[in-house]
């Protein structure tokens, strides 16, 4: 049988039939269904939703749908002993207390089991002391405080505004600075777009709204008690003292009304510059401590949350491939939410649900994809990407041999301005070609392609006439697949206009106000942006699973490798004297990139010309494409981050959300001028150049003619 016969419908009609079956009204209906009650990881409500999704995916026509459960470390507030922060006077009396909960949104007043705002995995504690305002608590903010302003955070409680970087990095930085507690808050400068009403009248954050979130520094480990291995029935668990990535100091989040009360009394040093000022009507003094009249008052934290080993459930659906059933294309997104999950994750889960329904409809008509498609509804993403990571750990041997691609499907929207895509360079051409075939949903672009509106609104900084595609970082469920296993990965969603909206993420992120109504009233009333995201995600999965030759272009990797090599070289060249002193050369890396470029070019020529009717040669060429991403994996991992094994990309050591290129070299060079032993530090730079050059050369050789 030819591959076309096996899939029963002509290739062009396949994709069109799949896309035509996707309906905005269904996504809307699914979103409503998924957002009526909270679905916190580890709760009965989320288990029930898992079973509902399992049942519906079976009805939609998947071959099998199973629950995969794991017992992982989660964190919850104490129901009888709430977390809060006080201002105390010299007698220890509490003269101000922060809110214990967010005021519920209209229509949700009687909903039970709304978890109050908390920082997941915070240890218990009741530290008291002077406050220091640390801006965003980024690495550079602590450099400014400690090196320029000579402010010592040791023994202080720090208050940091959310935004710019992952909250776990903020906590890690505060710990390293010696702080004994961290208060996180949402400043209106970052979470309130001027001119828009706060919820329920608009999509802005009200003063009582608070962002929940985990504060782990897992570096890809998954369950903190079982790093590297699945948290199954016979797992050996570490003691809590040896758990991976747990914070050592109490942490708690608050809204800007409460933050105003803490910040308005701040004394000490003035903010170093305007970048340290938010939009509250307070001076943004750094401290330490309160001003004049209030100098005897202190801040006290009361944190009583507990860490508990709890059962979680992934839903794994399979649509078996007709021709290459042992090749897996995975579409996965999480199901667990902090509260209602109106955007995160259910705007993504509703899209996955509709994609499954469309594939199921085609399958019921006799069609099958060429390759196997796996669909996943992950649990406990909000607690550190736990569900996806445990499943990948359990199935790592299968995945590393059979995994073609992973497409992530968390929140479908974070705005309604234009498309946003982060993916491996192997998928650039796939994304470009697909978006040229899809209609833009944007006003003013009627009858135009998605590619056109995307390129106009979000142009590539390097290539004119092309859209921006970003590097993969982390903070979502693709992490284990891409950063640990080296499976080509991508993600797509609709986003805001980053030029005009400087706030971080979307204002109501991880708050109780992330409801169905938020989406239906303010972000996407017609669900046209959700439909477009479904078409992009689903279209990518379709092409990856069904195209005869995998839709990967290795030449695009060559282009970015040269760009990344140029970038890291220019960073190193800020230290010309040391490079000379310690004989640091990037020649090996540039040579390897040159070789990769030439070999990739020749491989692409062969890809055009080979006999596609020969199944052995076809499989061989496809395997070279599939395993190219794998070839960038270093089995030893990055220094001190064994589960980040991709040599070309890793989450930034300073911001988990951001991707860094040549991370081993980058980290070796970072702040190198402050290292106590320059010879050792530059030796590590040289070692990392060696590792990178070897890896690029080795990857290039996987694309050479096999004999």
């Amino acid at each position: 049988k030819s591959s076309n016969e096996a899939t029963n419908i002509t290739p062009k009609h396949n994709m069109k039939a799949f896309l035509d079956e996707l309906k905005a009204e269904n996504i809307k209906k699914f979103l409503y269904n998924f957002t009526q009650i909270p679905h916190l990881a580890g709760t009965e409500q989320n288990f029930q939703l898992a079973k509902q999704i399992q049942s519906q995916w079976k009805e939609f026509g998947l071959d099998s749908v199973e629950l995969a459960h794991y017992d992982v470390l989660l964190s919850y507030p104490n129901k009888t002993h709430p977390n809060y922060i006080s201002i105390i006077n010299e007698d220890g009396n509490e003269i101000f207390n922060t809110s214990l909960f967010e005021p519920p949104p209209p229509g949700y007043e009687n909903v039970s089991d709304i978890v109050p705002p908390f920082s997941a995995f915070s240890p218990q504690g009741m530290p008291e002391g002077d406050l220091v305002y640390v801006n965003y608590a980024r690495t550079e903010d602590f450099f400014k405080l400690e090196r320029d302003m000579k402010i010592n955070c040791s023994g202080k409680i720090v208050i940091a505004r959310y935004g710019k970087v992952f909250r776990g990095n903020k906590v890690k930085n505060a710990q390293l600075a010696g702080a004994k507690g961290v208060i996180l808050y949402s400043d209106p400068a970052d979470y309130f777009a001027p001119g828009v009403k706060s919820y329920p009248d608009g999509w802005n954050l009200p003063g009582g709204g608070v962002q929940r979130g985990n504060i782990l520094n897992l570096n890809g480990a998954g369950d903190p008690l079982t790093p590297g291995y699945p948290a199954n029935e016979y797992a050996y668990r570490r003691g809590i003292a040896e758990a991976v990535g747990l914070p050592s100091i109490p942490v708690h989040p608050i809204g800007y009304y409460d933050a105003q009360k803490l910040l308005e009394k701040m004394g000490g040093s003035a903010p170093p510059d305007s970048s340290w000022r938010g939009s509250l009507k307070v001076p943004y003094n750094v401290g330490p401590g309160f001003t004049g009249n209030f100098s005897t008052q202190k801040v006290k934290m009361h944190i009583h949350s507990t860490n508990e080993v709890t059962r979680i459930y992934n839903v794994i659906g399979t649509l078996r491939g007709a021709v290459e059933p042992d090749r897996y294309v995975i579409l996965g997104g999480h199901r667990d939410s902090w509260v209602f999950g109106g955007i995160d994750p259910q705007s993504g889960a509703a899209v996955v649900h509709e994609i499954v329904r469309s594939f199921g409809t085609l399958k019921k008509e006799g069609w099958r994809p060429r390759r196997t498609i796996l669909f996943a509804s992950w649990d406990a993403e909000e607690f550190g990407l736990l569900g996806s990571t445990e499943w990948a750990e359990e199935n790592s041997r299968l995945l590393q041999e059979r995994g073609v691609a992973y497409i992530n499907a968390d929140s479908s929207i974070e705005g309604n301005y234009t498309l946003r895509v982060d993916c491996t360079p192997l998928m650039y051409s796939l994304v470009h070609n697909l978006t040229k075939e899809l209609k833009s949903p944007d006003e003013g672009f009627e009858g135009k392609s998605l590619y056109e509106s995307w390129t106009k609104k979000s142009p590539s900084p390097e290539f004119s006439g092309m859209p921006r595609i970003s590097k993969l970082g982390s903070g979502n469920d693709f992490e284990v697949f891409f950063q640990r296993l080296g499976i080509a990965s991508g993600r797509a969603r609709y986003t805001k206009n980053w030029e005009t909206n400087k706030f971080s993420g979307y204002p109501l992120y991880h708050s109780v106000y992330e409801t169905y109504e938020l989406v239906e009233k303010f972000y996407d009333p017609m669900f046209k942006y959700h439909l477009t995201v479904a078409q992009v995600r689903g279209g990518m999965v379709f092409e990856l699973a069904n195209s005869i030759v995998l839709p990967f272009d290795c030449r695009d990797y060559a282009v970015v490798l040269r760009k990344y090599a140029d970038k890291i070289y220019s960073i190193s060249m800020k230290h010309p004297q040391e490079m000379k002193t310690y004989s640091v050369s990037f020649d090996s890396l540039f040579s390897a990139v040159k070789n990769f470029t030439e070999i990739a070019s020749k491989f692409s020529e062969r890809l055009q010309d080979f006999d596609k009717s020969n199944p052995i040669v076809l499989r061989m060429m496809n395997d070279q494409l599939m395993f190219l991403e794998r070839a960038f994996i270093d089995p030893l991992g990055l220094p001190d981050r064994p589960f980040y094994r991709h040599v070309i990309y890793a989450p930034s050591s300073h911001n988990k959300y951001a991707g860094e290129s040549f991370p081993g070299i980058y980290d070796a060079l970072f702040d190198i001028e402050s290292k106590v032993d320059p010879s050792k530090a530059w030796g590590e730079v040289k070692r990392q150049i060696y590792v990178a050059a070897f890896t690029v050369q080795a990857a290039a050789e996987t694309l050479s003619e096999v004999a």
Epitope: F192, P194, G195, S279, K281, P283
Partner: antibody, heavy 124, light 107 residues
Framework: QVQLVQSGGGLVQPGGSLRLSCAAS????????MSWVRQAPGKGLEWVAN????????YYVDSVKGRFTISRDNAKNSLYLQMNSLRAEDTAVYYC?????????????????WGQGTMVTVSS | DIVMTQSPSSVSASVGDRVTITCRAS??????LAWYQQKPGKAPKLLIY???SLQSGVPSRFSGSGSGTDFTLTISSLQPEDFATYYC?????????FGPGTKVDIK
Amino acid sequence: QVQLVQSGGGLVQPGGSLRLSCAASGFTFSSYWMSWVRQAPGKGLEWVANIKQDGSEKYYVDSVKGRFTISRDNAKNSLYLQMNSLRAEDTAVYYCARVWDYYYDSSGDAFDIWGQGTMVTVSS
Amino acid sequence: DIVMTQSPSSVSASVGDRVTITCRASQAISSWLAWYQQKPGKAPKLLIYAASSLQSGVPSRFSGSGSGTDFTLTISSLQPEDFATYYCQQAYSFPVTFGPGTKVDIK
């Protein structure tokens, strides 16, 4: 359409009183803070007073405290400024203005809708 | 009270010119700043809020920037209807205060 129509200006002797009115239409008056802003002849703008949506909070510039009273009647969609013990330096065009809560704190952000202005002259 | 100063106090310009007006606050006001245009005998009109956000219906040739204490209003290409007096206003703390104004007239 959204508008503010003013009345009540005129000539008054020093020490005298005057009441300015401002009628709102085209928007939900009770949802907005309201203000009075004045402009002396040939001079710049000076904020005079603010009043909260329900009238529970009022703020004044120091120079009018104890002499001027801002008030509102939400049922009539009207804003008032009662001016007592008037002085020559109170001579100005008085504008009523809607406070636009473009940011999280609605107590005094920007003035997006203005009345046409009414002249108050304090002279003997 | 927060004192607002503007410079220049007046500027003569021609149609098509780029005009920049600066406003300085006596203390940091974050982005709590608005800009107004006033023509003789008329009420002021809101142009810019939150230091850089363009009010609905205002032409895009007007733009605002700045944060903290220093702010700028820019008219990228002056049009005949733009000849007027421009005021900045802080809303960081009571009392709300305005700058003294900058008059833009025909060269």
